[in-house]
């Protein structure tokens, strides 16, 4: 059974993941140039189901494409440093989902834009955090 300290650690990691995802979405929403239009043409796979920490496998598998799209956005007005950001997210995701069980991610049939993708995972984090508090 999870201890109070392990629950607290999980909650903190989820909060950090949530903030990182919110930061990306905010950075993208601030775009008012042709780069945003191009970014929105990239398609991301969405999880068929995302209700448990193990489902973060689906996010992990999309981190590389996410980094590639964010690299497009690099400019003096985009301060997110994709490599550092994605590296940070990757560390959190690996710790949260654990490596004991191998989970095969199932994806929905419809792909999504980067905005829809980020909103989905933000909602996922918020939902799990709510169950922990």
């Amino acid at each position: 059974a999870p201890t109070s300290s392990s629950t607290k650690k999980t909650q903190l990691q989820l909060e950090h993941l949530l903030l990182d995802l919110q930061m990306i979405l905010n950075g993208i929403n601030n775009y008012k140039n042709p780069k945003l239009t191009r970014m929105l043409t990239f398609k991301f796979y969405m999880p068929k189901k995302a209700t448990e920490l193990k489902h973060l496998q689906c996010l992990e598998e999309e981190l590389k494409p996410l980094e590639e799209v964010l690299n497009l956005a690099q400019s003096k007005n985009f301060h997110l440093r994709p490599r550092d950001l994605i590296s940070n997210i990757n560390v959190i995701v690996l710790e949260l989902k654990g490596s004991e069980t191998t989970f095969m991610c199932e994806y929905a049939d419809e792909t999504a834009t980067i905005v829809e993708f980020l909103n989905r995972w933000i909602t996922f984090c918020q939902s799990i955090i709510s169950t922990l508090t």
Partner: antibody, heavy 113, light 107 residues
Framework: QVQLVQSGAEVKKPGASVKVSCKAS????????VHWVRQAPGQGLEWMGI????????SYAQKFQGRVTMTRDTSTSTVYMELSSLRSEDTAVYYC??????WGQGTLVTVSS | DIQMTQSPSSLSASVGDRVTITCRAS??????LAWYQQKPGKAPKLLIY???NLETGVPSRFSGSGSGTDFTLTISSLQPEDFATYYC?????????FGPGTKVDIK
């Protein structure tokens, strides 16, 4: 629990830049993302942006995009907020806040010719 | 951006009164709402987070409720130290946004 101590009041001329510091103590520096919020005299609270102190990357409110830069120095557990091209309407108290629940004491920045 | 509105903008009350302040978001923010108290010359102080969770050390006369777009802060029995300005804040999505504030003064 973390405590935040901010740098002292500043008086700047229009067009200049200001750099406000926010030093953390009492807890792991990288545990909390740091927000910056400002409050003009007699006005409400306005969010400026957020920095991840471990990764050093930041995300800003659109209003300040291009004028604000948030940085950090992990060796001194300090985060910085620099605002450039100052104008009179930037006169405000600038707050740093760890996770939005622990706030610094505020730094008054006055922009006047 | 998510817009936050508060009502009333100010109110006069007496010690012992029950005071209710409402906050509305322009779109659903779930329960990702906080309430702050601010006194002149001081930094804001967190009272309530996640719409209804009382911050450690905050007196139990303060309570919060609501979800989605409509939220309420209630002070069950106003004390002399409660005269201040109260702000709601959403942190469901960035940019974080605050309500314009409600000033509570002595009747």
């Amino acid at each position: 629990q973390v405590q935040l101590v901010q740098s002292g009041a500043e008086v700047k001329k229009p067009g200049a830049s200001v750099k406000v510091s926010c030093k953390a103590s009492g807890d792991e520096f990288t545990r909390y993302y740091v927000h910056w919020v400002r409050q003009a005299p007699g006005q409400g609270l306005e969010w400026m942006g957020i920095i991840n102190p471990s990764g050093g990357y930041a995300s800003y409110a659109q209003k300040f995009q291009g004028r604000v830069t948030m940085t950090r120095d992990t060796s001194t557990s300090t985060v910085y907020m620099e605002l450039s091209s100052l104008r009179s309407e930037d006169t405000a108290v600038y707050y740093c806040a760890a996770g939005l629940f622990i706030w610094g004491q505020g730094t008054l920045v006055t922009v006047s010719s | 951006d998510i817009q936050m509105t508060q009502s009333p903008s100010s109110l006069s009350a007496s010690v012992g009164d029950r005071v209710t302040i409402t906050c509305r978001a322009s779109q659903s923010i779930g329960r990702w709402l906080a309430w702050y108290q601010q006194k002149p010359g001081k930094a804001p102080k967190l009272l309530i987070y996640s719409a209804s969770n009382l911050e450690t050390g905050v007196p139990s006369r303060f309570s919060g409720s609501g979800s989605g777009t409509d939220f309420t802060l209630t002070i069950s029995s106003l004390q002399p130290e409660d005269f201040a300005t109260y702000y709601c804040q959403q942190y469901n999505r960035f940019p974080v946004t605050f309500g314009p504030g409600t000033k509570v003064d002595i009747k």
